[in-house]
């Protein structure tokens, strides 16, 4: 049925589903201060441009009785349950920010005649790719695959002077939602990952991981996986590894890599983290006071969100162009705004772009250091450390394949 | 405009060492990449290592190990090079030359060149 | 570390005329990306060098279009279609494909 939007006559409101399955085990209540704060902000960005409009947000929670697992597997009937909600109010806002889960959102943007933009802090499956009214403030797992891509075919660097070609990937199905989608993205016999490799296995046990680690017939040097160290520990706690393992452990939303007092343990020195630059710090913020540094991040997403429909609505309403069209609904992507964190880029099909940061672990120092840098929007490496104190033989990484002689 | 300025020409006792200076300007310090690269008297160009000026550090050509040593101070946006152990075959035009990686070096802009004389 | 060689080492030539360098190297120089990392730059009697050519046939701004690049794989060749007097130099190839980057030898281009 046809649902009015409430967004005209000088009244705009966000539709913001508080949805019980959720990317990420974040309470509500977090978000809604999220939400709250970056309503502030836009307020105060529309009067200074001399906008006296009214910016709102209208929270749909569900039941939570039918929906109630938490993580992400049931989202996709409670985001369709959802929009009905929404439906039998007749009553929408300028724009939908809530989906996290790519069930949820992939489902919700097949069943709705989307004339309304969509704003997802998560959805990071390769099946929300290219939608024409989503936008993602989370980097999505395409942002990944290249970036592997393009490092793996790198072999110009001072530290890196073999291409690869192969790979193992382990992926146990307990891994958190980004990881999920992660991981998922790569084992994809269909993506542009698999289709660059000439060779990658998934290893799905915790003992198939374990015995390549010093398997001398291993068909590649490098595994991929994702998660915290304290989740590489628990799999391979001090089990030795063969000198020429790399590990490469992604790890995007966590910022406990730059902290000041961070030392790396033992177990990390065969290991590049693959992480996000930190943002300037936002521990000051009211929202992100009690959060983790994952969390941060996700509650970062739905405050730039409303920044972003802030952003637009400035821009049309300066315009003096309709909200309610589909000009507006396909006008999130290929702009920058201004976050509550810095300027925030999205690309042609209003997914963020981001600084990607390699990280190594020091011998010298024990700590964190940074290898090399990747702009998602260029998809372009930048090297850091011309001279890594590696624990890698000749402090270069090694070829993917054992006895494989320079290329 | 992008400008690579260099340090006078030196003239140096064999075993001892010598620091060449380079400051750059008309660009931001830290977005390119130094290399260096010596010319002998009627050689060819021999490239002798690089240094991120965004954190200092360094990575130089294995013929050059142990022996050179790039600095840079972002204050002044000044990079260095210095050479210890001199010998005669030394003797050489060093360059400065700013460049940027892009899934491969370039080298975009050069010094005007310093010449170093090793002799007895 | 990859070797290029250049030839000839010294190529005198008749003013308005044309003149080719060639470039060779002892492995090819694609990258993964498909992209080919050959330079080619000149250096002036008593001047710096500068760059004419970024990957293979790219030309650098304010660089005369009687010079272009070309070649794939492990030929190269720099062609000056009519030499002027300003032309005179050595030039050089130089690849950027791994690490390190290498200089070819150096042709030095002569007027007769």
């Known amino acids: 049925s046809q649902v009015s939007q409430n967004c005209h006559n000088g009244s705009y409101e966000i539709s913001v589903l508080m949805m019980g399955n959720s990317a990420f085990a974040e309470p509500l209540k977090n978000l809604e201060d999220a939400v709250n704060e970056g309503l502030e902000i836009v307020r105060g960005r529309l009067q200074n441009a001399g906008l006296n409009v009214t910016v709102n947000a209208t929270f749909m929670y569900s039941d939570g009785l039918i929906h109630n697992s938490g993580d992400c597997r049931s989202s996709t009937c409670e985001g369709l349950d959802l929009l009905r909600k929404i439906s039998n109010a007749q009553r929408m806002g300028c724009v939908l920010i809530g989906p996290s889960c790519t069930y949820s959102t992939f489902q919700m943007y097949l069943d709705t005649e989307l004339s309304y933009p969509m704003i997802s802090a998560g959805s990071f499956g390769l099946s929300c790719d290219y939608k024409e009214t989503l936008t993602r403030l989370m980097s999505p797992a395409r942002k990944l695959m290249y970036f592997l891509v393009n490092f793996w075919k790198t072999n110009d660097l001072p530290f890196k002077t073999y291409s690869w070609s192969t790979s193992y990937v382990y992926k146990n199905g307990t891994e958190t939602e980004d990881c999920f989608w992660y991981l998922n993205a790569l084992e994809a016999s269909v993506s542009y990952f698999s289709h660059e490799l000439g060779f990658k296995v998934v290893l799905r046990q915790d003992k198939e991981f374990q015995d390549i680690l010093m398997d001398h017939n291993r068909k590649s040097n490098v595994i991929i996986m994702c998660g915290g160290p304290e989740f590489l520990y628990k799999l391979k706690g001090d089990r030795a590894v063969a000198e020429d393992i790399v590990i490469i452990l992604v790890d995007l939303f966590n910022d406990q890599y730059f902290e000041d007092n961070v030392t790396a343990p033992d177990y990390m020195k065969n290991v590049l983290v693959l992480t996000l630059s930190p943002g300037n710090s936002l521990l000051n913020s009211s929202f992100s006071r009690n959060l983790s540094p994952t969390k941060r991040d996700f509650a970062l997403a739905y405050l730039n969100g409303i920044l972003l429909f802030g952003h637009m609505l400035k821009i049309f309403l300066e315009n003096g162009e309709n909200i309610t069209t589909p000009k507006f609904a396909h006008a999130f992507r290929n702009l920058t705004f201004e976050g509550y964190d810095g300027p925030v880029t999205l690309d042609d099909w209003g997914d963020v772009d981001s600084t990607m940061v390699l990280l190594y672990t020091s011998v010298d120092t024990k700590k964190y250091k940074v290898l090399l840098t990747y702009d998602t929007h260029v998809n372009k490496t930048y090297p850091v450390d011309m001279s890594p104190t590696f624990t890698w033989k000749n402090s270069k990484l090694p070829n993917d394949i054992t006895g494989r002689g320079p290329q | 405009e992008v400008q690579l300025v260099q340090s006078g020409a030196e003239v140096k006792r064999p075993g001892s060492s010598v620091k060449v200076s380079c400051k750059a300007s008309?660009?931001?310090?830290?977005?390119?990449?130094m290399h260096w690269v010596r010319q002998a008297p009627g050689q060819g160009l021999e490239w002798m290592g690089i240094?991120?000026?965004?954190?200092?550090?360094?990575s130089y050509a294995q013929k050059f190990q142990g022996r050179v040593t790039m600095t840079r101070d972002t204050s002044t946006s000044t990079v260095y090079m210095e050479l210890s152990s001199l010998r005669s075959e030394d003797t050489a035009v060093y360059y400065c030359?700013?460049?940027?990686?892009?899934?491969?070096?370039?080298?975009?802009?050069w010094g005007q060149g310093t010449t170093v004389t090793v002799s007895s | 570390d990859i070797v290029m060689t250049q030839s000839p080492l010294s190529l005198p030539v008749t003013l308005g005329q044309p003149a080719s360098i060639s470039c060779r190297s002892s492995?090819?120089?694609?990258?993964?990306?498909?992209?080919?990392?050959l330079n080619w730059f000149q250096q002036r009697p008593g001047q710096s060098p500068r760059r004419l050519i970024y990957?293979?046939?790219n030309r650098d701004s304010g660089v005369p279009d009687r010079f272009s690049g070309s070649g794939s794989g492990t030929d190269f060749t720099l062609k000056i279609s009519r030499v002027e007097a300003e032309d005179v130099g050595i030039y050089y190839c130089?690849?950027?494909?791994?690490?390190?980057?290498?200089f070819g030898g150096g042709t030095k281009v002569e007027i007769k």
């Open positions: 030359a700013a460049g940027t990686y892009s899934s491969g070096w370039t080298i975009d802009y």
């Open positions: 008309g660009y931001t310090f830290t977005s390119y990449y």
């Open positions: 240094i991120n000026p965004s954190g200092g550090s360094t």
């Open positions: 492995q090819s120089l694609v990258y993964t990306d498909g992209n080919t990392y």
């Open positions: 990957k293979v046939s």
């Open positions: 130089m690849h950027s494909k791994q690490w390190p980057p290498t």
